[in-house]
């Protein structure tokens, strides 16, 4: 997991987006589920302009959006990777 | 430790091109969200963002200056490289050399080089 | 191009003074913004980050605060150390932009 060398935050994102980011922008997006002294589920997205965003966990275009990503993944390569890994 | 250190010319003339070299370590420009940039400060004047490159070579300039300018990297090297075209005296500014990595919570530019003074002049 | 409007360009304070810094956004940058403190002969530091969050290191008596598009750095209780002047920067888009900066002295 990529940590920042400069923050001792246990959850990575200090505040969230609920506006709606396109899968055609979308390069990466990691779920973290709860632990290691993060409380709360944390979905950051990288996009394709070099930016990386925190998105609220229950927008419900993000939860579509992961279905989508995640059947695209059982038949071909995702378009937008989705990996879900403990805070490290 | 990361550390970036600039070199170039320290006084140049009016039309030549201004070549940039920024040497780092501590890190590398190979993973995924590493990228390294290139800022300057007019003596005594504000912070002007010129260009930043990425791990996967996707190159961002500051559109006021994005003809002159060419960013470029040579990984393997731990280098980053900046040249400015057509050159004026109004280009004489310290030179930063500065890290970016796509982490989460994200800061631009957390690492900085020490600064390379260029003048130009007639 | 998102410009950043910083005030004021210089400012003397005395030691134990409260000193507030401020940057306007002239378009919706959602807290991506960095302060930087530039120490005399120094390179810039990251002090704060979207908007609010201290960077390692930095000591409580920096905060940073969000008002709408204003944004605003305050010491609570100004200390020799930071003297210094003062950048913000915006990273919600292409092309990056910095304030003018803001010089503090000492009074």
């Known amino acids: 997991i990529l940590e920042a060398h400069y923050t001792n935050l246990k959850c990575r994102c200090s505040g969230v987006i609920s506006t709606v980011v396109g899968l055609n922008i979308i390069d990466r997006i990691q779920v973290t589920p709860p632990g290691n002294g993060c409380p709360k589920t944390e979905v950051v997205i990288w996009t394709k302009m070099k930016k990386v965003i925190c998105v609220n966990p229950r927008a419900k275009w993000l939860q579509r959006l992961l279905r989508h990503v995640q059947s695209k993944s059982l038949s071909s390569t995702p378009q937008a990777p989705v990996s879900k890994r403990r805070a490290a | 430790q990361v550390t970036l250190k600039e070199s170039g010319p320290e006084i140049l003339q009016p039309s030549q091109t201004l070549s940039l070299t920024c040497t780092f370590s501590?890190?590398?420009?190979?993973?995924?969200?590493?990228?390294v940039g290139w800022i300057r400060q007019p003596s005594g004047k504000g912070l002007e963002w010129l260009a930043n490159?990425?791990?996967?070579?996707?190159?961002y300039y500051n559109p006021s200056l994005i003809n002159r300018l060419t960013i470029s990297k040579d990984t393997s090297n731990n280098q980053a490289f900046l040249k400015i075209t057509n050159v004026d005296t109004t280009d004489s500014a310290t030179y930063y050399c500065?890290?970016?990595?796509?982490?989460?919570?994200?800061?631009?530019?957390?690492?900085w080089g020490q600064g390379v003074m260029v003048t130009v002049s007639s | 191009d998102i410009q950043m409007t910083q005030s004021p360009s210089s400012m003397s304070a005395s030691l134990g003074d409260r000193v507030t810094i401020t940057c306007q956004a002239s378009?919706?940058?959602?807290?991506?913004l960095v302060w930087f403190q530039q120490k005399p002969g120094r390179s810039p530091r990251p002090l704060i980050y979207?908007?609010?969050n201290l960077a390692n290191g930095v000591p409580s008596r920096f905060s940073g605060r969000r008002s709408e598009s204003d944004y605003s750095l305050t010491i609570s209780s100004l200390e020799s150390e930071d003297m210094a002047d003062y950048h913000c920067l915006q990273f919600k888009q292409y092309p990056y932009t910095f304030g003018a900066g803001t010089k503090l002295e000492l009074k």
């Open positions: 979207y908007a609010t």
């Open positions: 500065v890290r970016s990595e796509l982490v989460m919570p994200y800061v631009p530019f957390d690492y």
């Open positions: 490159i990425w791990w996967d070579d996707d190159k």
């Open positions: 378009q919706d940058i959602e807290n991506d």
């Open positions: 501590g890190f590398s420009l190979s993973p995924y969200g590493m990228g």
